[in-house]
């Protein structure tokens, strides 16, 4: 049975961070791991994709991960099917969104005295909790003319007077985490003597060494004072300015200008407008450094004619939200149309061979612009150059087979020979071109070929026979040096083919005729009762018409085959005594003796002073000990034949006698005693 | 002993429809995938369908829409509704546990 | 659509010979290795011999053997037995729980 040793369980994600879900079996055979999202089967994109059998995610979607995820695992063999717990994301997430005007309907129907009701756009989940601000400054619950109702995310002020103008912002945070409003609201109760904004600031993004404006401006009866305030609140004046803002201007209008900015530049900066009456009001910007950073190489793609493929841009990290756009051949691609822009994604439909090449992803923000290439080859379906012909190739030549072929991406050519592979060895080579070459051209060659020449767009094949031109051979050639034995009957086979069936002949090399006792048959050498006259030089002619004809010559010895007069026998010696191993064969040529001893040839020119090779071929060692225990083989060689014959020698202690034992007691086994 | 049985083949006119029954027995069917492949007279294998072990089903593309595969647990049996019948679709028509265990087939045949 | 070809569609050979045949699919089967390789004789139901691409089902000689991976695959027989005439299917398993067949090659004497 499929058994689940990791189960996917439900878990908190974060909005746009990696997540994991984990699924491993263990099953009798091997199995296949596939997930479903609410029953559906998932496809792996470059976000969400099978990493061995758990489920990967790049970046956690909202929308695309809510619902169940459930790992299954199949036994594809049995067609037994296992399914895990059903798994699903808490995924946690917050937007920005506007602070807007919820009653009265409309800003021209706010009046002093009347109840204004502002809701904060921010949305999240968890629900995230919400404090709002004038001008920059919490508002706190709870305070004696304004509630806050965190359920409905508004603010209540009733009733609104002119105590109550300014800008209205708000934050909401939660377990993910926070976001600010992405536009304020202003509200406008006159009171001529309170501070009013007129122009609030706003966040800046700037790049390294370039300016950063910050505007602000209030208004009031008589005119209000404006001051600006670093993060650690030190005040940034014309005649004033902290030791890190030295390239800092406060304009007679109110806007702050920063020139060349560095890192530490970064960060918040307050401005402050005070009227005769009323309460400051403080608002806030942030001013932060561009940055982006580099993006993932492509792997080169190779599509096929007439399919829909997307390839994805993953875009840079970087500040401001680098945007993405995809070019090709230097010209941006349109959003429409049948090559395009979708999102990040470039689209092409209906694949088209002239869509092949480098497309570019640009990158681009205040800190600078990134690019990457990406080449897209389309496969197209191999056309011929050279088809393979039907050929007449020469035994033991090389012959080649053409297999010309043109595609994009260069296409694989494949050989088949009786329908069956031919994988590249010493005697079949295809080169790059396609051309198949057979090294040594062989008569069972001669048969059907077929070449496939093929791109993932598809293949195309032909066929050719090749017909052997076989050469006039000796098949085999006769060996040229043969032994005949003495008064036996012999033969020596003599067979050769050629295009056309070869006649075969013998001669004596001096010309001299064969004599009665020998016949040629069919080109077999026949001796009925072979005599020492018969040895001597042969000629084996072979001829046919078209080819002429070849011979082989063959020196014939007669001999008599050897055999052993004295064979060795098997030996026992004691240490340090003398082993004498015996041999002596007779044959014609008279045999020449070699000893083996523990599979070595022992060499009579280096056998040290221990051992000796006699003349008659016998085999004495002295001084025997215990490492030359072994088997020793004697042979027997001549030009004819060889023979061989072994024994074993055991080399042992000497016993210490008993007093049981009488000085005459044989040894338990034969013995050499010297 | 684990075995598949198909029956419910026949002859029926174009146009028509056939409901084709598999049962199974040595085992329960909501442990295992069940496909139904056809092979056509003299021609080759053509997959049709799966219905999986939850019961949820997938088709082969040309087979969408006019063929319908189901089962009933309690009886053990898989069924494949064949609708709008033509002469193509004269087939014998198996059905198999997984890869290796195959029922012996049934022939259906649409001819008027 | 998925596309699988098989090839040759027929194939003579000799007691003895090495086979191999070949399976190209329109696109990647699963897990890369999601393949089976079948044997069906004349009014008979098809056999498993190959399954994930290189497995030998159990009961199935040694001589039967399985390669490839992605879109590409291969079944060879080392050394053909009188036994082993017969068609052969190559089956394809992909994403969304969808299968598809080779359209068979047929094994004869030559």
């Known amino acids: 049975a499929i058994v689940f040793i990791k189960q996917p369980s439900s878990q908190d994600a974060l909005q746009g961070r990696r997540a994991l879900l984990r699924c491993e079996v263990e099953a009798p055979g091997p199995v296949h791991v596939y997930w479903l999202l609410d029953g559906a089967p998932v496809q792996d994109t470059e976000r969400r994709f099978a990493q061995g059998s758990s489920l990967s995610f790049a970046a956690v979607d909202r929308l695309q991960d809510s619902g169940t995820f459930q790992c299954v695992a199949r036994d594809d063999v049995t067609g037994e099917e296992a399914r895990s717990a059903n798994a699903s994301f808490n995924i946690k997430w917050i937007e920005a969104g506007p602070v807007v005007l919820k009653h009265p309907a409309s800003e021209a129907e706010i009046q002093p005295q009347t109840q204004v009701t502002l809701r904060c756009h921010i949305d999240g989940h968890p629900r995230p909790t919400y404090q709002w601000f004038r001008d920059g400054t919490p508002l706190s619950d709870g305070q004696s003319n304004h509630t806050v109702s965190s359920k409905e995310r508004n603010l209540t002020l009733r009733p609104a007077g002119p105590e109550h103008s300014g800008l209205y912002s708000c934050c909401a945070h939660s377990a993910f985490g926070q976001a600010c409003s992405s536009q304020n609201f202003t509200l406008s109760i006159a009171d001529e003597s309170f501070a009013r904004v007129v122009l609030a600031p706003q966040d800046v993004v700037v790049a390294r060494y370039e300016e950063a404006m910050f505007h602000c401006q209030f208004s009031a009866q008589p005119p209000p004072s404006l001051q600006w305030l670093f993060e650690d609140e030190t005040p940034i004046t014309n005649r004033s300015r902290p030791p890190h803002l030295r390239r800092a201007t406060v304009f007679a209008n109110g806007s702050l200008l920063l020139t060349q900015v560095r890192p530490r530049n970064a960060g918040i900066y307050r401005c402050i407008g005070q009227g005769q009456r009323g309460p400051p009001i403080i608002l806030e910007a942030t001013l932060h450094l561009a940055e982006i950073e580099d993006m993932p190489l492509f792997e080169p793609r190779v599509f096929t004619a007439g399919s829909e493929e997307r390839v994805t841009c993953l875009p840079p990290k970087g500040l401001p939200e680098p945007s993405v756009w995809w070019e090709h051949a230097g010209v941006r691609l349109p959003t429409h149309g049948r090559v395009y822009q979708k999102g990040h994604e470039l689209v092409l439909a209906n694949i088209a061979e002239s869509d092949a090449g480098v497309y570019t992803c640009h990158a681009a923000n205040l800190a600078g612009q990134r690019r990457q290439d990406v080449n897209i080859t389309v496969a197209t379906v191999p056309s011929w150059l050279k088809k393979p012909q039907d050929s007449q190739l020469e035994e033991g030549k090389p012959g080649y087979l053409d297999c010309l072929t043109q595609a994009t991406p260069k296409p694989t050519v494949v050989w088949y020979r009786n329908q069956m592979l031919i994988s590249e060895d010493s005697r079949f080579e295809v080169f790059k071109n396609g051309t198949l070459r057979i090294n040594s051209v062989e008569v069972y060659d001669g048969t059907w070929y077929r070449c496939m020449s093929s791109t993932p767009a598809g293949s195309i094949e032909a066929q050719a026979r090749v017909q052997v031109l076989e050469k006039l051979k000796f098949t085999p050639p006769p060996q040229p040096q043969q032994c005949m034995e003495f008064d036996k009957e012999a033969t020596v086979p003599c067979s050769a083919t050629g295009r056309e069936k070869p006649t075969i002949k013998w001669e004596r090399a001096d010309g001299s005729s064969l004599p009665e006792w020998v016949t040629d048959n069919a080109g077999t050498l026949h001796f009925a009762r072979v005599t020492r006259d018969d040895a001597g030089n042969y000629t084996c002619i072979a001829s046919n018409g078209p080819q002429g004809q070849i011979r082989a010559h063959v020196q014939l010895t007669v001999a008599v085959f050897i055999t052993f007069k004295v064979e060795p026998e098997r030996t026992t010696v004691y240490q340090g005594h003398t082993a004498l191993l015996q041999c002596e064969a007779q044959g014609d040529p008279k045999p020449l003796i070699q000893w083996k001893g523990k599979d070595r040839i022992l060499d009579p020119t280096k056998l040290g002073p221990r051992m000796h090779i006699f003349q008659n071929g016998s085999l004495v060692i002295h001084d025997v000990a215990p490492e030359d225990s072994g088997r020793y083989t004697c042979i027997a060689g001549n030009s004819c034949n060889i023979k061989h014959t072994e024994a074993p020698l055991y080399v042992v202690d000497k016993p210490v006698p008993e007093e049981s034992e009488g000085p005459g007691s044989p040894p338990p086994y034969k013995m050499i005693q010297t | 002993e684990v075995q598949l049985v198909e029956s419910g083949g026949g002859l029926v006119q174009p146009g028509g429809s056939l409901r084709l029954s598999c049962t199974a027995s040595?085992?329960?069917?909501?442990?295992?995938?069940m496909n139904w492949v056809r092979q056509a007279p003299g021609k080759g294998l053509e997959w049709v369908g799966i219905i999986d072990s939850s019961g949820s089903t997938y088709y082969a593309s040309w087979a969408k829409g006019r063929f319908t595969i189901s089962r009933d647990t309690s009886k053990n049996t898989v069924y494949l509704q064949m609708n709008s019948l033509r002469a193509e679709d004269t087939a014998v028509y198996f059905c198999?546990?997984?890869?290796?265990?195959w029922g012996q087939g049934t022939l259906v045949t649409v001819s008027s | 659509e998925i596309v699988m070809t098989q090839s040759p569609s027929t194939l003579s050979a000799s007691v003895g010979d090495r086979v191999i045949i070949t399976c190209q699919s329109s696109q990647s089967v699963y897990n890369n290795n999601l393949l089976a390789w079948y044997q069906q004789k004349p009014g008979k139901a098809p056999k498993l011999l190959i399954y994930?691409?290189?497995n030998l089902h159990s009961g199935v000689p040694s001589r039967f053997s399985g390669s490839g991976s992605g879109a590409e695959f291969t079944l060879t027989i080392s050394s053909l037995q009188p036994d082993d005439f017969a068609t052969y299917y190559c089956?394809?398993?992909?994403?969304?729980?969808?299968?598809?067949f080779g359209q068979g090659t047929k094994l004869t004497v030559l």
């Open positions: 089956q394809g398993g992909y994403n969304g729980n969808i299968y598809a």
């Open positions: 040595g085992f329960s069917l909501s442990n295992y995938v």
């Open positions: 198999a546990r997984g890869l290796y265990l």
């Open positions: 994930y691409t290189s």
